[in-house]
Interface confidence: low
């Protein structure tokens, strides 16, 4: 027998469907309405013939009070192939609901998405979170997508991005915007993280995630955080294979005052890298490749400072190097 | 960790008013929403009132008689209940999403208080 594609927890809090079948019953879907959090993985299936079955261009306005009653706060959907009109009409009528947060993964969204209608409303999500999803407008998705929004979106993430990069010109400002993470996009580097950073559209930036993103120093991050006008309090930049030195024709970069956490943890750093704020409460720097301890002035004026994970704290370690045998054990790394 | 701590509830008689109250304490960035909710004996847990981005949502059967506030600089918000009828009876919890919470600062995170009792006594 086959599995049942949809399983809702004892709680009626969580809710999962994984459509594998060619031709699924999507009916079976219905036993998520009672469900706050509701996954739905389509196998890799094309949504084009779903355009065939439902009426995409429909007032929503006529299961506002259906979709209101739903008590569904978090909604991934991953694993499909959707045409654009059809993305729209699910959010036209999400927009009814009390949904919070969004998630999209592993989705190919084909053809473009219409403009907004004067009558409709947006959809007020908290939270949007988008991981290896490719649109076939390229640049100007994040702009197509953002019209049907409200513009109080808290929280954006994008991994695994096809085009990291937006067009600016099209992009309005997100002026709730606290955390922006663009983590898991290792093609983006500087050049990129200064193409998405939209100069102006991130004024309310208080967390930014950048972990494997093909960073390279601290100091070129800071001067693409400086010609975007982005001034977080928080920056992770872990998991990037982090230069300790910089390069000396390169200006030298104010950070902004407002940064008081930067994680560092995970870079491969062998020293402390030149070019940090004077100033911070908090400085990650677990999990490196530190073989001594750094020395008071290479490390800015810190509050809360973490080293953990690095050979010099082990006895016995040696720096790990290309073919050599690291018998000495790194904690939490 | 952030908690939810509700105040307020008790025993009241018919056509009675209470406020309840509901802090919220830990390290936030932004509180998101802030809503009460109800659970009747044998029955669901169902919205009451909820204010989000600004905009208050109300549930029909409290519509007019039951008022919600939030008083931002205290990370707190109110519900005014008048006119209570003995269908009100139930236990009122304290609802708020969150985003940029001790938690992460990149995940929308939804937290529960303990509850507070309300009967309306005919």
């Known amino acids: 027998t086959t599995p049942e594609p949809c399983e809702l927890d004892d709680e009626d809090f969580r809710c999962v469907c994984n459509f594998s079948e060619p031709q699924p019953d999507w009916s079976e879907a219905f036993q998520c309405v009672s469900a706050v959090e509701v996954e739905i993985h389509a196998g890799g299936l094309n949504l084009e013939p779903f355009l065939k079955r439902v009426d995409a261009d429909a007032d929503p306005r006529q299961y506002a009070d259906t979709v209101k009653a739903l008590r569904v706060r978090r909604l991934t959907v991953g694993a499909a192939q959707v045409p654009a009109q059809l993305l729209v009409g699910a959010l036209r009528v999400l927009a009814y609901s009390r949904l919070k947060e969004l998630t999209l993964e592993d989705l190919k969204i084909t053809g473009t998405m219409p403009p907004l209608p004067l009558e409709a409303t947006g959809l007020a999500l908290s939270s949007l979170r988008l991981r290896n999803v490719s649109w076939a407008t390229g640049r100007s998705w994040l702009a197509e997508l953002q019209q049907w929004l409200k513009p109080g979106l808290k929280v954006l993430s994008i991994a695994q991005a096809h085009s990291p990069a937006f067009s600016c010109e099209q992009v309005r400002a997100f002026p709730a915007l606290t955390s922006l993470d663009l983590s898991d996009n290792p093609g983006l580097g500087e050049r990129g993280l200064m193409a998405a950073l939209c100069p102006h559209k991130f004024p309310a930036i208080q967390n930014l995630a950048l972990r494997n993103t093909g960073m390279e120093t601290p100091t070129g991050v800071c001067a693409a955080l400086a010609a975007a006008g982005v001034q977080p309090h928080s920056l992770d930049l872990s998991h990037n294979s982090l230069r300790a030195t910089v390069n000396p024709s390169a200006p030298r970069c104010m950070w902004s005052s407002a940064l008081n956490s930067l994680n560092l943890s995970f870079a491969g750093l062998e020293q402390v890298p030149k070019g940090l704020p004077a100033k911070l409460r908090v400085l990650d720097l677990s999990c490196n490749r530190l073989n001594r301890a750094p020395q008071p002035d290479e490390l800015p004026e810190v509050d809360n400072l973490t080293l953990d994970g690095n050979p010099f704290l082990v006895p016995g370690t040696a720096l790990p190097h290309e073919g050599s045998m690291n018998s000495g054990v790194v904690p939490a790394c | 960790q952030v908690q939810l701590q509700e105040s307020g509830g008790g025993l009241v008689q018919s056509g009675g008013s209470l406020r309840l109250s509901c802090a919220v304490s830990?390290?936030?960035?932004?509180?998101?929403?802030m809503g009460w909710y109800r659970q009747a004996p044998g029955k669901g847990r169902e919205l009451v009132a909820e204010l989000s981005d600004g905009a208050t949502n109300y549930a029909d059967s409290v519509l007019g008689r039951f008022t919600i506030s939030r008083d931002n600089a205290k990370n707190t918000v109110y519900l005014q209940m008048n006119s209570l009828k003995p269908e009100d009876t139930a236990v009122y919890y304290c609802?708020?999403?969150?985003?940029?919470?001790?938690?992460?600062?990149?995940?929308?995170?939804?937290?529960w208080g303990q509850g507070t009792q309300v009967t309306v006594s005919s």
């Open positions: 830990g390290s936030i960035f932004s509180i998101v929403d």
């Open positions: 609802n708020a999403d969150l985003t940029g919470s001790s938690y992460s600062p990149y995940r929308y995170l939804e937290v």
